[in-house]
Interface confidence: medium
């Protein structure tokens, strides 16, 4: 017969039946054919496509003594644990010479209690904040109607009357449970129960109240927490490394943050033991019995500069005639800011104090007034930052210069500027 048609009589004497059942069902489809000569391999088709991995068995029974006599061939296709993907039209197929024969079709259908494709999931939500829950079920048979329940109480008068696939909850003030029921002609299936835990809302308006070189006082406005009072708030501070790049909503900073807990109220906390003149990022979260809120975004803050905590070190002052050479080293104590320079004061026993701003140099040559006969001349030095002067050094007496002692040439200060303010002399 031309073109692989079934012009010759079909060899099939038994065709697949129909199977309709619930998910998980196990069933068998069977077809039978009678052929002359060598029995062919029977292939199974679903929706016109050969099943490559079919769980099929083939039995062949000769009807005579001779190889060329007729054979009865029976093929059985086993369907284990029926799923939606198994449904469709089934046929047997054989190749006989250059011809292709297919059996009459049988059908596999699915019918039973609704099956959930999606169920509500446990989640946490901020108090009084809207959220959605999802539930999706299918038959067959269709239609499948959903009924949502909150704390075991139906949210609609009947299945299919309320929200279906998505439930919009405008907000909760207490931890609640949600589930959905799927109804079809075969009955009802109930989904898992999802617990929705109500956490405090994220605090708002985190801001600085006051700043000291080594401490910051911060305050914030708590968010709503439903029926659960806040137990405490947690504040984190982290050094703002230049390379850290903490942005709003970015992942946590790489180093371990400084963490402090605040009893509430008041919604305020003094953060101590900080570095002066240092940028930090801070954030806050508040906790109830149900758990913590989300963190606020990182807020950039900075401790102010302080004054140096100690005087310059190793001050030496030597005198040679009408000139005095003074030099010193940077304070060993913390500067608490950016060093802007040094102030120097000198005074004789019966002469007024002379005050000078030296800048960042650590040495100076003074041109003394008069013939150099001023007695008991002493010098004091203090370092200063933008926040002000640090402590003055103890007075250092001017020592007479001894021959052989090195004395580098320095810029002479002939006319020290008169300060606009006076400095106490110890």
């Amino acid at each position: 017969a031309p073109r692989g048609t079934q012009a010759e009589e079909s060899p099939f004497v038994g065709n697949p039946g129909n199977i309709t059942g619930a998910r998980g069902l196990t069933g068998t489809l069977r077809c039978q054919l009678q052929v002359q000569g060598e029995p062919p391999e029977v292939h199974w088709l679903r929706d016109g496509q050969i099943l490559e991995l079919a769980d099929s068995t083939q039995t062949q029974v000769p009807l005579g003594e001779d190889e060329q006599d007729d054979w009865i061939v029976v093929s059985q296709l086993r369907i284990t644990s029926l799923q939606l993907s198994d449904t469709g039209q089934y046929q047997c197929l054989v190749f006989l010479g250059h011809q292709t024969f297919v059996s009459q079709p049988g059908y596999v259908g699915l019918e039973g209690l609704p099956y959930f494709l999606e169920e509500p999931e446990d989640r946490t939500v901020a108090a009084n904040t809207p959220f959605n829950l999802s539930c999706q079920a299918q038959g067959p048979p269709e239609p499948v109607d959903l009924l949502w329940l909150q704390d075991a109480v139906p949210l609609a008068t009947a299945p299919g009357h309320g929200p279906q696939r998505s439930l919009h909850v405008p907000g909760l003030n207490k931890t609640s449970s949600f589930s959905c029921e799927a109804h079809n002609a075969k009955g009802v299936t109930t989904s898992r129960t999802a617990t929705i835990t109500v956490l405090p809302q994220q605090p708002r308006n985190l801001h600085l109240v006051s700043r000291q070189p080594t401490e910051l006082e911060v305050a914030w406005t708590p968010g709503l927490s439903g029926i659960y009072p806040l137990t405490h708030c947690t504040l984190q501070a982290v050094l703002s490394d230049d390379g850290m790049g903490i942005q709003a909503g970015e992942p946590d900073p790489p180093e371990e943050p400084l963490t402090s807990q605040a009893s509430v109220p008041p919604h305020q906390l003094r953060l101590g033991s900080l570095h002066p003149h240092t940028p930090y990022h801070i954030r806050v979260a508040c906790t109830s019995s149900q758990g913590p809120s989300s963190w606020t975004h990182w807020l950039p803050v900075e401790t102010p500069e302080g004054v140096p905590l100690g005087p310059p070190e190793n001050i030496s002052a030597t005198r040679n005639g009408s000139q005095a050479f003074v030099h010193w080293q940077e304070p060993r104590a913390p500067l608490q800011g950016t060093l802007l320079g040094y102030r120097l004061a000198y005074q004789g026993q019966d002469t007024p104090e002379v005050l000078m701003d030296i800048g960042l140099r650590q040495e100076v040559t003074l041109e003394l007034q008069g013939d150099g006969s001023v007695s008991n001349l002493t010098v004091c030095v203090a370092a200063y930052t933008a926040a002000g002067d640090g402590p003055w050094s103890l007075p250092v007496p001017l020592e007479a210069w001894r021959p052989g002692q090195a004395q580098p040439v320095h810029q002479l200060v002939k006319e020290p500027s008169t300060p606009a303010f006076s400095w106490p002399w110890w």
Partner: antibody, heavy 118, light 112 residues
Framework: QVQLQQPGTELVKPGASVKLSCKAS????????INWVKQRPGQGLEWIGN????????NYNEKFKNKATLTVDKSSSTAYMHLSSLTSEDSAVYYC???????????WGQGTTLTVSS | DIVMSQSPSSLAVSAGEKVTMSCKSS????????????LAWYQQKPGQSPKLLIY???TRESGVPARFTGSGSGTDFTLTISSVQAEDLAIYYC????????FGGGTKLEIR
């Protein structure tokens, strides 16, 4: 005797859509895949997609996913291809082809010549 | 997706000569279940629908002259015309032929 009947010509304006038909006879319509093939003038053959009338299962060539929609009407044993947002690029001969199992022989319709012109 | 490559794209021969044309697929067309290669060869004459010549890589369609022979398995296939006739002037296409189809670009046969 297997037959696939297609209208000879269709003339439509750019931007419009068209529904090409393919009426099957001489076999059990729900048992065999119907394929659609495009051939532009002087060009080769391009497979568009196919549909199995028994279950409405269908497959598409990625290139035609947003252009062609395949449907069947079992009661009249007719397969349809809906082509949308037509342009001159869609002017071609469109064949419907019945696919036999396992890559064995197939049957071709005579083709519909679609002309998209204003 | 399976890609089908045909060569040559065209060839011109005199009547009576033997012709071979090649079709390569990007993956094997041999179905392990049915042990058949899902490859078909078509002939399309000017103004006509494609006509099936060979299916299952080597099975000649009923009514097709014996001078047309298909061979090959897996990824490499050949169509041979043992003695070309004037009426063989056409474009020849190979096709991966199971469920999702892919056609080769065609080989145009001209008679000198």
């Amino acid at each position: 005797q297997v037959q696939l009947q297609q209208p000879g010509t269709e003339l439509v304006k750019p931007g419009a859509s068209v529904k090409l038909s393919c009426k099957a006879s001489g076999y059990i319509f729900t048992n065999f895949w119907i394929n659609w093939v495009k051939q532009r003038p002087g060009q080769g053959l391009e497979w568009i997609g196919n549909i199995f009338p028994g279950s409405n299962s269908s497959n598409y060539n990625e290139k035609f996913k947003n252009k062609a929609t395949l449907t069947v009407d079992k009661s009249s044993s007719t397969a349809y291809m809906h082509l949308s947002s037509l342009t001159s690029e869609d002017s071609a001969v469109y064949y419907c082809v019945r696919d036999y199992y396992g890559g064995s022989p197939d049957y071709w319709g005579q083709g519909t010549t679609l002309t998209v012109s204003s | 997706d399976i890609v089908m490559s045909q060569s040559p794209s065209s060839l011109a021969v005199s009547a009576g000569e033997k012709v071979t044309m090649s079709c390569k697929s990007s993956q094997s067309l041999l179905n392990s279940k049915t042990r058949k290669n899902y490859l078909a060869w078509y002939q399309q004459k000017p103004g006509q629908s494609p006509k099936l010549l060979i299916y299952w890589a080597s099975t000649r369609e009923s009514g097709v002259p014996a001078r047309f022979t298909g061979s090959g398995s897996g990824t490499d296939f050949t169509l041979t015309i043992s003695s070309v006739q004037a009426e063989d002037l056409a474009i020849y296409y190979c096709k991966h032929s199971y469920n999702l189809w892919t056609f080769g670009g065609g080989t145009k046969l001209e008679i000198r």
